[in-house]
C-alpha cells in the first residue's frame, strides 16, 4: 500500500532587524510569476548564508510570506513585492506560513494518536 503525504500548515510572526547586507533572502511569486499552481503568493526561494534571516533561523526556504509590516502580499506583481521588502525599514515584521511535510502511514491505516472522525 502507498503512503500518503500530508502537510501541516502553521503561521508565525517573525520580526527581523535589517543587517548590513539587508534581510538576506530571495523571493519568487506574484501575479505575474506564479510559483505554486493557482497561487500568486510570495514564497521564500533562498535564505542567504550569514544574512539577517539566516542568523534569526526561523524563516525557511519554501515559506509563504503573507504580509510585511502588516501589509498583505495578496495580488501583487513580483516587482511590487520586492519593492515592499526593500522599503520596509530597519525593523521588519513578517507573517509567514510554514508547510511541514508529514509522511503518514499506508492509506486506510489510522495511527493511535489520530482522530477517529
Amino acid at each position: 500500500m502507498n503512503g500518503r503525504v500530508d502537510y501541516l500548515v502553521t503561521e508565525e510572526e517573525i520580526n527581523l532587524t535589517r543587517g548590513p547586507s539587508g534581510l538576506g533572502f530571495n523571493i519568487v511569486g506574484g501575479t505575474d510569476q506564479q510559483y505554486v499552481s493557482n497561487d500568486s503568493g510570495i514564497y521564500v526561494s533562498r535564505i542567504k548564508e550569514n544574512g539577517a534571516a539566516a542568523l534569526d533561523g526561523r524563516l525557511q526556504e519554501g515559506d509563504k510570506i503573507l504580509s510585511v509590516n502588516g501589509q498583505d502580499l495578496k495580488n501583487l506583481l513580483h516587482q511590487d513585492a520586492v519593492d515592499l521588502f526593500r522599503n520596509a525599514g530597519y525593523a521588519v515584521s513578517l507573517r509567514v506560513q510554514h508547510r511541514l511535510q508529514v509522511q503518514n502511514g499506508p492509506i486506510g491505516h489510522r495511527g493511535e494518536g489520530d482522530p477517529s472522525g
Partner: nanobody, 125 residues
C-alpha cells in the same frame, strides 16, 4: 547539480561585436536571475548586466546602449550581445545564477549570486 557554461568569447577589433552565451543545466531558468559579470586583469569582478526572474534587464552605465541581455528559457540560455566594443571591455566574462529576486539589491550585485560559470575571455584589440 547546477552548472553554468559560458561560450562565444574571443578576439574582437575595437568597434566590433560579439555575443556570449550562458547555458544552464540542473535547474529551470524561469525563476532565476542571471547576471553577467567581468573581471579584467588586476581588477575586481564587476557587474555588467543582468536579467531578473521576471525578465527585467539592468545594465551598468558604461555599457548602456552598447550591450543587450536576453534570455531563452526554452533553451536554458542567456545571451549578452556586445556591440561597439572598446579596449576597456577586455576581460573574462562570467555568468551567475540566483534563485528568485533578492529583497535587498538588484541583480547587478555580485554578492547575491550562488552559482557561477568558469568564464569566457573577450579581448578587444
Amino acid at each position: 547539480h547546477v552548472q553554468l557554461v559560458e561560450s562565444g568569447g574571443g578576439l574582437v577589433q575595437p568597434g566590433g561585436s560579439v555575443r556570449v552565451s550562458c547555458v544552464s543545466s540542473g535547474f529551470i531558468l524561469d525563476y532565476y536571475a542571471i547576471g553577467w559579470f567581468r573581471q579584467a586583469p588586476g581588477k575586481e569582478r564587476e557587474g555588467v548586466s543582468c536579467i531578473d526572474s521576471v525578465g527585467r534587464a539592468y545594465y551598468v552605465d558604461s555599457v548602456k546602449g552598447r550591450f543587450t541581455i536576453s534570455r531563452d528559457n526554452a533553451k536554458n540560455t542567456v545571451y549578452l550581445q556586445m556591440n561597439s566594443l572598446k579596449p576597456e571591455d577586455t576581460a573574462v566574462y562570467y555568468c551567475a545564477a540566483d534563485f528568485g529576486s533578492s529583497v535587498d539589491s538588484t541583480c547587478l550585485n555580485k554578492q547575491q549570486y550562488d552559482y557561477w560559470g568558469q568564464g569566457t575571455q573577450v579581448t578587444v584589440s
